[in-house]
């Protein structure tokens, strides 16, 4: 629960949040996600770093790996083999991009309590995983895939053509990692470990982004990344499957691409194993409004994979792009051919559908003016999913169970009434066969993780309730938060307002708009956070508002696809509209309004500042996109089409920040970027700065040397301190 607010006599014992609190993470919370290893067992790393196995049914727990063993190789992560004979220990973690990293791996033999010697793994490894059954290993080293029958065996090399920045096997290149797969891996074991599927990405023809990494040497290093910007040559992807028992028999077999996809540029979007001999691949045209789901079967006689046209399912959007942020993935039922999938219904809301033969004959499972967000698990008799249906708040998430074994199927909200005030935003983690599950509540109160019986939904125990955090917050004057909506011209704008602790409607407060606003994003969520904006409200007396305008998610396709092919227009308009409505509320000092955002939010904040409305006194853009021609093809083209004359070049040119350089003359602008940003390249801010200089417009800027898109470590402290000074100066608040 949010700690109860104490008033009057006790109020003087309460203190406001400080910036130091935020930078030190004093009020961060913990979650508990069980590492499930069976229907009733899970692993968890204890406070003293032992790896402990818990059996829910016996109530017993025992240490399977001591902290001493972990420490002996400086392990920061572990993975138990499904046959429970081995554990891999991961150390020397070295981050690459958002998901990818390399590490050194040691294999510990639980049967004899020793590390496996002989045929040790090479280092550093780019990805490693156990087979789903037994203790086979697949790993990627120097862009090639290797297989081990058992940890002590010599490896079998599956691919030979891997080359840095050229050919990637079993791992994605930059753009697939960031914008399509959202993983560090691109290989998938079949359910019993018979086959291994993998992607090969050929980046040979992709233009390279190069930037300096200054380091400490006399000469800076140059970082080169094959990075396709909008309209550029894309990676060429191929999917292969190899028999892991007889890998040399016929070697890797390529899975055919559906003809309607292969006729022009395309993407591979995901792979889902159905059985050991049936696999489902999803493909997407480069113009991302057509997706094809293809179910392929192993032909024993030819040792090949057959993908009949009758098992191709097409998903097409006529009003926008296919899917939400990504095209949804199927969850197969026990018959191994029919599946459940989320896509838009006839009313333009994303809902669960059951597909047995064709998409046209799909049976709609959920419906209403709300959206199904995620399918967690399908069992013989139940389907568990999350949605924002409850009480019509799009920024909430509750977990539902639909009984699919009975007709008509009955629906039950598992979480809606558990801790109604404290918990309105849930996710879940299920054990095998959904025998048990963990619920993780993110707010709006203090987060709590609980364990539940999968049949009765009964709470078994609290896994993490953040008691220390609750106690620490008892003497803190937290801001008030409210989530409400504005109705403007048939558009519903949900907003979250963060108000100073002693908020008084009759007074005037400076307003800071925090914006992200990217397609299929959601900022107005019922989650707990004690962060920088909490401090700005608590200590500095600012009102902070977050607004979900057109282009944002989970409120239907009309709102979501409104920005299709027109990025940078309606997102900005809706922030401005909301600000005008906030002014009308009477407690905003209209001479002290600011806007800030990061990444896409930096783009929107820049455009809002340059909108010429006179509403904003100042604003901050952190690592902004400045022209869609500078950003990644996969992301950009999904929403904008191609930057060609016969497609959408005109709007690419019209939607740049640089084109509005003149309009920054009457605002205070702080532009911030990391020089080693692999995602939104420093180029974006360099071009804004150049345009402002050429227009003789004064502005403030800060770069962070050798920092990426996250501006982490010491840069974070410097960044928030710097932005705080800037805002306080803008709002004439004493330091």
């Amino acid at each position: 629960l949010r700690p109860s607010r104490v008033h009057n006599s006790e109020e003087n014992t309460m203190r406001a949040l400080t910036l130091k609190d935020i930078l030190n993470g004093t009020f961060s919370y913990k979650t508990f996600f069980p590492n499930w290893i069976s229907g009733q067992e899970y692993l968890h790393q204890s406070a003293d770093n032992n790896i402990v196995l818990y059996n829910i049914e016996t109530g017993q727990s025992y240490t399977i790996l001591s902290n001493r063993t972990m420490k002996s190789v400086n392990a920061s992560n572990y993975g138990l083999s499904p046959d429970r004979q081995f554990v891999y220990l991961e150390s020397d973690y070295s981050k690459l991009w958002r998901y990818s990293y390399t590490a050194t791996y040691y294999i510990y033999d639980l049967s004899n309590g020793e590390f496996v010697r002989g045929n040790e793994l090479p280092r550093p490894i780019q990805y490693l995983c156990w087979s789903p059954v037994g203790s086979k290993l697949a790993y990627v080293y120097q862009n090639n895939i290797y297989l081990k029958q058992r940890p002590g065996d010599p490896p079998f090399q599956i691919t030979f053509n891997g080359r840095e920045n050229k050919i990637f096997n079993g791992i994605p290149d930059w753009v697939y990692e960031e914008e399509m797969l959202a993983t560090k891996y691109a290989l998938w074991w079949s359910p019993n470990g018979k086959f291994l599927a993998y992607a090969e990405f050929n980046d040979t023809d992709i233009p390279v982004i190069a930037y300096s990494y200054y380091g400490d040497e006399q000469y800076p290093r140059t970082i080169n990344i094959p990075y396709p910007k909008a309209g550029a040559k894309n990676p060429v992807v191929r999917i292969f499957i190899i028999d892991t028992t007889y890998p040399a028999y016929v070697g890797p077999q390529e899975v055919p691409v559906p003809a309607m996809i292969a006729s022009s540029d395309y993407y591979f979007s995901w792979l889902t194993w159905v059985t050991d001999e049936r696999v489902c691949l999803q493909w997407l045209k480069r113009v991302q409004n057509v997706s094809v789901l293809s179910i392929c079967d192993f032909r024993e006689d030819w040792q090949t994979w057959d993908c009949p046209k009758t098992q191709e399912h097409i998903e097409e959007s006529r009003t926008g792009w296919a899917g939400g942020f990504f095209v949804s993935t199927p969850v197969f039922s026990y018959d191994a051919i029919s599946y459940y999938k989320i896509f838009s219904d006839k009313d333009g809301y994303k809902h669960i559908h059951y597909i047995k033969d064709t998409v046209e004959n799909a049976i709609q499972i959920t419906s209403g003016k709300w959206e199904a967000i995620n399918i967690f698990r399908v069992t013989q008799d139940s389907l568990f999913y999350s949605s924002n249906e409850f009480e019509e708040y799009p920024g909430r998430r509750n977990i539902y169970r639909i009984s699919i074994g009975s007709y008509p199927p009955s629906k039950k909200c598992v979480t809606c009434h558990l801790r109604k005030e404290r918990c309105q935003y849930y996710t879940a983690s299920f054990s095998d066969y959904a025998k048990y599950y963990a619920l993780v509540c993110y707010g709006p109160g203090i987060p709590i993780s609980t364990l539940h019986d999968g049949r009765t939904d009964q709470e078994i125990k609290i896994l993490e309730e953040n008691k220390e955090l609750e106690n620490a917050l008892k003497n803190i004057q937290l801001p008030k938060e409210e989530i409400k909506k504005l109705e403007v011209d048939e558009i519903t704008l949900w907003y979250k307002m963060i108000l100073p602790p002693q908020f008084d409607r009759s007074k005037k407060y400076p307003l800071l708009i925090q914006v992200y606003g990217g397609p299929c994003s959601q900022s107005v969520r019922s989650v707990f956070a004690v962060n920088w904006i909490s401090y700005l409200a608590s200590k500095e007396g600012m009102v902070i508002a977050l607004v979900d305008g057109r282009g944002t998610a989970f409120q239907g396709d009309k709102l979501l696809y409104a920005v299709y092919r027109k990025l940078g227009v309606y997102e900005v308009e809706d922030q401005i509209t909301a600000v005008r409505k906030f002014i009308e509320m009477g407690f905003i000092d209209e001479k002290r309004i600011a806007i800030w955002g990061w990444s896409y939010g930096g783009y929107v904040s820049s455009l809002a500042l340059a909108s010429g409305t006179g509403l904003f006194k100042c604003g901050i853009a952190v690592a902004p996109v400045s022209s869609w021609e500078y950003y990644a093809s996969v992301y950009t083209e999904r929403f904008m089409g191609l930057p060609t004359k016969d497609d959408n070049l005109e709007h690419y040119k019209n939607s740049t920040v640089m084109a509005r350089a003149e309009y920054f003359r009457n605002v205070d602008y702080l532009l911030i970027h990391g020089t080693a940003d692999d995602n939104v390249h420093f180029q974006n801010s360099a071009q804004i700065a150049k345009a402002l200089v050429n227009a003789q417009v004064d502005f403030q800027a800060m770069w962070y040397s050798d920092q990426n898109h996250g501006l982490s470590g010491l840069s974070t402290n410097h960044l928030y301190t710097h932005m705080t000074h800037f805002l306080k100066q803008c709002f004439s608040l004493s330091d």
Epitope: Q149, R150, F156, A248
Partner: antibody, heavy 118, light 107 residues
Framework: EVQLVESGGGLVQPGGSLRLSCAAS????????MSWVRQAPGKGLEWVSW????????GYADSVKGRFTISRDNSKNTLYLQMNSLRAEDTAVYYC???????????WGQGTLVTVSS | DIQMTQSPSSLSASVGDRVTITCRAS??????LNWYQQKPGKAPKLLIY???SLQSGVPSRFSGSGSGTDFTLTISSLQPEDFATYYC?????????FGQGTKVEIK
Amino acid sequence: EVQLVESGGGLVQPGGSLRLSCAASGFTFRGYIMSWVRQAPGKGLEWVSWISPEGSRTGYADSVKGRFTISRDNSKNTLYLQMNSLRAEDTAVYYCARLLYGTWFDYWGQGTLVTVSS
Amino acid sequence: DIQMTQSPSSLSASVGDRVTITCRASQSISSYLNWYQQKPGKAPKLLIYAASSLQSGVPSRFSGSGSGTDFTLTISSLQPEDFATYYCQQATLLLPTFGQGTKVEIK
């Protein structure tokens, strides 16, 4: 330590039968392809047969197809070779070997001699 | 079936010599080529797998190279314990075949 120990060899008349056994230890037997390789006196190595980890798939050299049958009992960690209709040219030392990835023979037994003679 | 041809069938060499044995496949076998050492009355022993990977415990004086159809086993400095017969072997299409062997004798 991986160990493979063959047994069952001996003298048999042409047309006769013999069953070879190979007891495996020191590794997870049920996880590997196993094989028989033979070597006639003073000659080179000749692969005879292989069997998949679970025992459902087998392969045979043309020279023994239809006469020899490979099998395994994973509960006993034992590999077998049933040899029927034996011929003089089947005389050889028979080695039990682990066929890793169906590609290379990484561990071998010491061999058992089969002599087919009248 | 794929035929494997080894050459020479025998060779005489002295301790410390560099010895090279070649193996040719009748069709491409990628890098699925292995080398074994066999001493009289003993079982063969794996030396090199996948054309160039040294089996654990095998001295580093042994090395393998090649891909496609032509492969080589090299002993960089022959030791007394290396006098033996060497076999190459392939296993594409799950039909393993061996070369006829190369006998390395003391000069």
